[in-house]
């Protein structure tokens, strides 16, 4: 069956049954989460807005699915698999009792099993399981997963350790001051320079020393990781992000709805199948995309690519290439690119290196 | 790459019978939800059944319940829809279309066949 | 039980005109809203599901939005192959369609 291609997974509670406290909702779906995320690599995230993985509803009825629920007893709630739109979604039937104990239905003990199906689970045999069908309360003081359960869900994403045996873990933040250190891509938003890294990035504040390392999806949880091309519009407060074919606007640092969108729809032939890296230079009004050993230049004002592009990085910018990582502009006149680590200052009016530097050398390393 | 062809539609007699056949490819079918949806002339579309990846559950539109019934053969990736006490207002193009895999149906009917023409009339 | 209001029922554009197309349901849905574009004599395909996510392999001028229970489809400048009849669509109810015609 199909299976959750990530580690980092978000969820929503989309509204709150009123049998409950608020509170007590939000600590029982985050305890169910805890008990997978106990026995696997999968790390959970709550968010408040935007598109999540799992999309918890209370519902009564027909609420949107095929899957009218049937009033108080009966079925309980339902999961849909792992996958995009309603996949995930987890739905609890409002016309239960919802409590924190062994009186009503049991919140927590309820959207542990739901969840498993959300991760990908099926009914298991054994009655002592959470994914047992038929729903028996159990004190949730001792509640521990069966033999069964973890051999299920760990036969699916692996053990807690499993994320640490993957070449480069994508759960461990990389060494700043490490020399070897490359960036996916660099931009400027507003007097910052955001360096990205796997699902990290770091925050350089113009001619401060300090920086700090995020998450991308603390910031922007509807975003993937390991992003790899970026670039400003500061005049519209648009920063555009790229992974893969997609494209993603952000605007006033917030995601804009709609997004990711395709590539294409900057006019890049089919064979490009992702941007290396992307800068907008204010003085021209253009924005050039970096990809293998070429560069389009982008008229961002008539929204299309200009006549005679690709052209070869090495030819019209001496001493760079033949391909990128990262590049970003910064003080009027210069662009930085990035080659593994190292950086090169490039003066775009002199049209030739100034300076090479190590990539990590914003950090005071 | 995914195909679904319907077959078995023509001409049939108020009160008659007809079985409408999905033949699958492309894909595993044994998995997935199928559903039934058809058209009537110059009119828009209207969801007729869902049947699960085994077999279970199904549903029915209210206007064709009791009269149609979907099932599957997942050894043959087949769909089918037999339709009794056929009435005028059912002359329609039927389509098959596939929805998610898992024990619950989405409603998300990301591939659809192109269709056969069921007429009812005397 | 759950219905869909769809509007307009036709439209008139011109080629490189933004078009928006809404849907309405008469009770929460969250975000299970799907579009459909159908050309004569073909059968539907699905240009937008979770109302906002593009499906593979449909141009980027589509676009969906919406939540709970307003959505809209909107194309940002339509191109000759755009005009059809489209559709919402959640479970097992469809909106009524709206068919975009030349002006």
């Known amino acids: 069956g199909p299976v959750w291609r990530k580690h980092y997974i978000t969820y929503r509670i989309n509204n709150y049954t009123p049998d409950m406290n608020r509170e007590d909702v939000d600590y029982a779906i985050r305890k169910a989460f805890q008990v997978w995320s106990n026995v696997t690599p999968l790390k959970f995230s709550k968010i408040n807005t935007g598109m999540a993985d799992i999309l918890v509803v209370f519902a009564r009825g027909a609420h949107g699915d095929f899957h009218a629920f049937d009033g108080k007893g009966g079925i309980l709630a339902h999961a849909f698999g792992p996958g995009s739109g309603i996949g995930g979604d987890a739905h609890f039937d409002e016309d239960e009792f919802w409590t924190t104990h062994s009186g009503g239905t049991n919140l927590f003990l309820t959207a542990v099993h739901e969840i498993g199906h959300s991760l990908g689970l099926g009914h298991s045999s054994d009655p002592k399981a959470v994914m047992f069908p038929t729903y028996k309360y159990v004190d949730i003081n001792t509640f521990r997963l069966s033999a069964d359960d973890i051999r299920g869900i760990q036969s699916l994403y692996g053990d807690p350790k499993e994320n640490q045996r993957l070449p480069n873990p994508d759960n461990s933040e990389p060494a700043l001051c490490d020399p070897n250190l490359s960036f996916d891509a660099v931009t400027t938003v507003g007097n910052k320079i955001f360096f990205f890294k796997d699902r990290f990035f770091w925050l350089k504040v113009s001619e401060r020393p300090k920086t700090s390392v995020n998450l991308i999806s603390s910031l922007w949880p509807t975003l993937p990781s390991g992003i790899e091309a970026a670039y400003e519009i500061e005049a519209r407060n648009q920063v555009f992000l790229f992974k893969d074919d997609k494209y993603w606007l952000i605007s006033n640092l917030r995601p804009e709805p709609n997004y990711p969108k395709s590539i294409h729809s900057f006019g890049f032939p089919n064979f490009v199948k992702k941007i290396d890296a992307a800068v907008f230079n204010p003085r021209f009004y253009r924005t050039y995309f970096f990809v293998d050993n070429q560069y389009w230049r982008y008229d961002e004002r008539r929204q299309m690519m200009d006549p005679g592009y690709p052209k070869l990085i090495t030819k019209n910018f001496q001493g760079i290439g033949p391909k990128i990582d990262a590049v970003f502009y910064s003080k009027n006149k210069y662009y930085y690119f990035f080659q593994g680590s190292n950086q090169f200052e490039y003066d775009f009016l002199l049209q030739r290196i100034t300076k090479t530097l190590k990539s990590n050398s914003w950090f005071g390393c | 790459e995914v195909q679904l062809l319907e077959s078995g539609g023509g001409l049939v007699q108020p009160g008659g019978s007809l079985r409408l056949s999905c033949a699958a490819s492309g894909f595993t079918f044994s998995p997935y939800w199928m559903h039934w949806v058809r058209q009537a002339p110059g009119k828009g579309l209207e969801w007729v059944s869902g049947i699960g990846p085994s077999g279970g559950p199904t549903f029915y539109a209210d206007s064709i319940k009791g009269r149609f019934t979907i099932s599957r053969d997942n050894s043959k990736n087949t769909l089918y829809l037999q339709m009794n006490s056929l009435r005028a207002e059912d002359t329609a193009v039927y389509y098959c279309a596939k929805d998610i895999r898992g024990p619950y149906s989405s409603g998300l009917f990301d591939y659809w066949g192109r269709g056969t023409l069921v007429t009812v009339s005397s | 039980d759950i219905q869909m209001t769809q509007s307009p029922s036709s439209l008139s554009a011109s080629v490189g005109d933004r078009v928006t197309i809404t849907c309405r349901a008469n009770q929460s849905i969250y975000t299970y809203l799907n579009w459909y574009q159908q050309k004569p004599g073909k059968a539907p395909e699905l240009l937008i599901y979770?109302?906002?996510s593009l499906q593979s392999g449909v141009p980027s001028r589509f676009s969906g939005s919406g939540s709970g229970t307003d959505f809209t489809l909107t194309i940002s400048s339509l191109q000759p192959e755009d005009f059809a009849t489209y559709y919402c669509?959640?479970?097992?109810?469809f909106g009524q369609g709206t068919k975009l015609e030349i002006k």
């Open positions: 669509q959640q479970a097992g109810i």
């Open positions: 979770a109302a906002s």
